[in-house]
């Protein structure tokens, strides 16, 4: 912590501005008022302090604040919030999005996962919901942040939003979170027709149970191997070799390419060679021909 | 006084590895954000990455990103940049420099990396 | 990115003259701008931060003004050891651009 020293008279700081770039540590520390700070914040950001200057100027904000700092500080943190934890900022509560719309540019491009994720965490929480303007926002301003929310905040995203989602936006979605959104998903585009419904639902099929994908197999879909890697895996076992040729359709021939990668190796081990050589793709692995598949999870559920 | 010590460069192949460190004394390395600059032959001078005191926070310039990473061990008081799949234009002259946001206050003396078939 | 250009790229000049260098950025910077000296071979060396501050150690013959778009380095009265290559580069935003450089020769 940076030392208690007394201001000298000359150094009295009346006004944030310029002057202060020459200021050592130990003279800021005296002579910067924090409320004097809190409410100079939108001067902060264009006054060219070091690493070091701006440490300061945190910790003088954190005596001032240690439940948290309120939004009007927030909204002007500027690169101040290059310094904040995810600590830090699972202290405030902000519900404007001029608010999120200003710290995501500043966080734009530097890889601080952990920091964004909290602040959007911090912004649904303050809404009480992820609604149709924050996922706007998160869409225009930081692509794929969607994804940095946990199922539980996913799951109060209405299905009403799920429409202005890109595929893009869920790129670095995981299971979990895509178990969360399918459902919606499902929901919000109920009403559209065969071809059309496949388009916007297909970057969700990550949460698709198997009913599902047997559904969309019927439906002349040729859904793309990226696609299909990226279904669960026990949602693909399930799947007959016919149902996976119809779910892909033309691109059934990618299988032989992803022949060693899950969910594709999985889903070989436990079809029938015989099954598997009706595709002609040379793929290998399958249960051989005469032996009995015992499902002994058949008969655990039932003893 | 500071000091900043690169080492690491070399003769490299099109799609080769290369790691480089910068060891740093004279100062207190964990107070401080730190940076890698490259000066290709003859040419100017380009700003490729940093990282934060804690190493928390990264940002990586588009024409290395995905292919170099930056890291910090502070208990060894040393900067590293991992160069992968390495391109005749990475060739250049690579300087570790102590980051004030205001400038880049310190500079090592550069090491030579050379990406050719 | 913010673009930085210097101007000239290069000047001749003599042991004792007054030598300007400019420096334009692409947008506003405010005062977020370093200049640096390098000499063949060298590291560069940091002369001035935040538009107009002289390093430590730096000789006062060197000293820098503007702000917004438009900087100036100057040097009053050119030294034997100042012949070299000059940068400005900016701190205003990510990611940091450096001019192209001027070199400054004897005449």
């Known amino acids: 912590d940076v030392e208690r020293t007394t201001c000298p008279p000359e150094k009295e700081v009346h006004e944030i501005d310029e002057n202060l770039i020459f200021y050592k540590k130990r003279e800021l520390e005296a002579c910067v008022d924090a409320a004097l700070l809190a409410a100079q914040m939108d001067r902060v950001d264009a006054i060219p302090f070091t690493y070091e200057q701006l440490d300061v100027l945190k910790h003088k904000l954190d005596e001032l604040y240690p439940q948290g700092y309120p939004e009007s500080v927030i909204r002007h943190l500027g690169h101040l919030f290059l310094k904040m934890s995810p600590e830090d900022i699972r202290k405030w509560n902000v519900t404007s999005l001029e608010t999120l719309k200003a710290l995501l540019k500043v966080s734009k491009g530097h890889e601080m996962s952990a920091q964004v994720a909290t602040l959007i965490d911090r912004v649904v929480v303050g809404r009480g919901q992820l609604d149709k303007d924050t996922a706007d926002t998160l869409t225009a301003f930081c692509p794929g942040c969607l994804c940095s929310l946990s199922p539980e905040r996913l799951s109060s995203v209405p299905p009403s939003v799920i429409g202005a989602v890109r595929p893009q936006d869920l790129d670095t979605c995981g299971p979990r979170q895509l178990d969360v959104l399918y459902p919606k998903a499902r929901l919000a585009f109920q009403n559209m027709s065969g071809s059309e419904y496949f388009v916007k639902i297909r970057p969700f099929l990550g949460g698709a149970p198997t009913e599902d994908l047997k559904a969309l197999s019927q439906q002349n879909v040729s859904m793309d191997l990226a696609t299909f890697m990226k279904l669960r895996r026990e949602a693909v076992l399930p799947l007959t070799v016919a149902e996976v040729q119809k779910l892909l359709g033309p691109h059934v021939e990618g299988l032989k390419v992803e022949e060693q990668h899950s969910p594709v190796r999985d889903w070989i081990l436990k079809q029938r060679q015989d099954d598997l050589d009706t595709l002609g793709l040379g793929l290998q692995g399958g249960i051989p021909n005469g032996y009995l598949i015992l499902d002994l999870s058949v008969r655990e559920a039932l003893s | 006084q500071v000091q900043l010590v690169e080492s690491g460069g070399g003769l490299v192949k099109p799609g080769g590895s290369l790691r480089l460190s910068c060891a740093a004394s004279?100062?207190?390395?964990?107070?401080?954000?730190m940076s890698w600059i490259r000066q290709a032959p003859g040419k100017g001078l380009e700003w490729i990455s940093y990282i934060s005191n804690s190493g928390s926070i990264i940002y990586y310039v588009d024409s290395v990103k995905g292919r170099f990473t930056i890291s910090r061990d502070n208990a060894k008081n040393s900067l590293y940049l991992q160069m992968n799949s390495l391109r005749a234009e990475d060739t250049a002259v690579y300087y570790c420099?102590?980051?004030?946001?205001?400038?880049?206050?310190?500079w090592g003396q550069g090491t030579l990396v050379t990406v050719s078939s | 990115d913010i673009q930085m250009t210097q101007s000239p790229s290069s000047v001749s000049a003599s042991v004792g003259d007054r030598v300007t260098i400019t420096c334009r950025a692409s947008q506003s910077i405010g005062s977020w701008l370093a200049w640096y000296q390098q000499k063949p071979g060298k590291a560069p060396n940091l002369l001035i931060y935040?538009?107009?501050s002289l390093q430590s150690g730096v000789p006062s013959r060197f000293s820098g003004s503007g702000s917004g778009t438009d900087f100036t380095l100057t040097i009053s009265s050119l030294q034997p050891e100042d012949f070299a290559t000059y940068y400005c580069q900016q701190a205003n935003s990510f990611p940091r651009t450096f001019g192209q450089g001027t070199k400054v020769d004897i005449k």
């Open positions: 420099a102590r980051d004030v946001r205001t400038a880049f206050d310190y």
């Open positions: 935040a538009a107009s």
């Open positions: 004279g100062f207190t390395f964990s107070d401080h954000y």
